[in-house]
């Protein structure tokens, strides 16, 4: 299975890095400093 961070979730994380957790088959965002939220869209 391809990493969805390189495909359909390429632009999912607004101010952060997309990470695909294989064990959970889920995408999460590692936010840049000062940003938070599911998509790192809140400051």
């Amino acid at each position: 299975k391809k990493n969805p961070c390189n495909a359909e979730f390429q632009n999912f994380c607004i101010h952060g890095e997309c990470k695909y957790i294989e064990h959970l088959e889920a995408v999460t965002c590692k936010c840049q400093q000062e940003y938070f939220g599911e998509r790192c869209g809140e400051k």
Epitope: K19, E22, H23, E25, K30
Partner: antibody
């Protein structure tokens, strides 16, 4: 209450096959990765296989790769281990284990938080 | 592959003693300040039980006399005051995202 119950162990001849099952209850099975861990008599713990929540990703050590296949049926809350071309060194108690985890700020940390009671597999002629 | 080595392999101690078990990884199991190292207790004929996760977090229901510390390649499990029910075998395990997810060889804690 989280419960994991293994079954399917027994005596099998070298080169033979066996299918282990693990029945899960007390939690949302489809939300957790699962693993098999074994313990040879008088020896330590050895990780055998892991499967992701939906079954898309499977992992094996070199010692069982190509011989063992892990699978799951989320509708039945069940985990399986198909073991082929069995060898004497596969003799062990086989445990199924749940992957507990922390997921925060992009970090994923996991651990085996619940274990079954184990099922004994003996490979001998 | 990451190898995990525990020391000592066996240990004799008395009730009330402070006991330390160490676990060394062949390479770092840290990532950006997080340590991917867990500790388990196993009694004869029983399944292992999680004690400590992420190097220093006490699993729910585990007595506070158990603690974990360390980072990088060197980790420690400490029992501050041994109780009769603590005599068992202890295992460390690395849980980085890269398999194989290896265990240490175990430390058997016996009554002196």
């Amino acid at each position: 209450e989280v419960q994991l119950v293994e079954s399917g162990g027994g005596l099998v001849k070298p080169g033979g096959s066996l299918r282990l099952s693990c029945a899960a209850s007390g939690f949302t099975f489809s939300s957790y990765a699962m693993s098999w861990v074994r313990q040879a008599p008088g020896k330590g713990l050895e990780w055998v296989s892991t499967i992701s929540t939906g079954g898309s990703h499977t992992y094996y050590p070199e010692s069982v790769k190509g011989r063992f296949t892990i699978s799951r049926d989320n509708a039945k809350n069940s985990l399986y281990l198909q073991m082929n071309s069995l060898r004497a060194e596969d003799t062990a108690v086989y445990y199924c284990a749940r992957h507990g985890y922390l997921l925060y700020e992009g970090y994923y940390e996991w651990y085996f938080d619940y274990w079954g009671q184990g099922t004994l597999v003996t490979v001998s002629s | 592959d990451i190898q995990m080595t525990q020391s000592p392999s066996s240990l004799s101690a008395s009730v009330g003693d402070r006991v330390t078990i160490t676990c060394r990884a062949s390479q770092s199991v840290d990532y950006e300040g997080h340590s991917f190292l867990n500790w388990y207790q196993q009694k004869p004929g029983k399944a292992p039980k999680l004690l400590i996760y992420a190097a220093s977090n006490l699993q729910s229901g585990v007595p506070s006399r158990f603690s974990g510390s360390g980072s990088g390649t060197d980790f420690t499990l400490t029992i501050s005051s041994l109780q009769p029910e603590d005599f068992a075998t202890y295992y460390c395990q690395q849980s980085t995202e890269n398999p194989p997810y290896t265990f240490g060889q175990g430390t058997k804690l016996e009554i002196k």
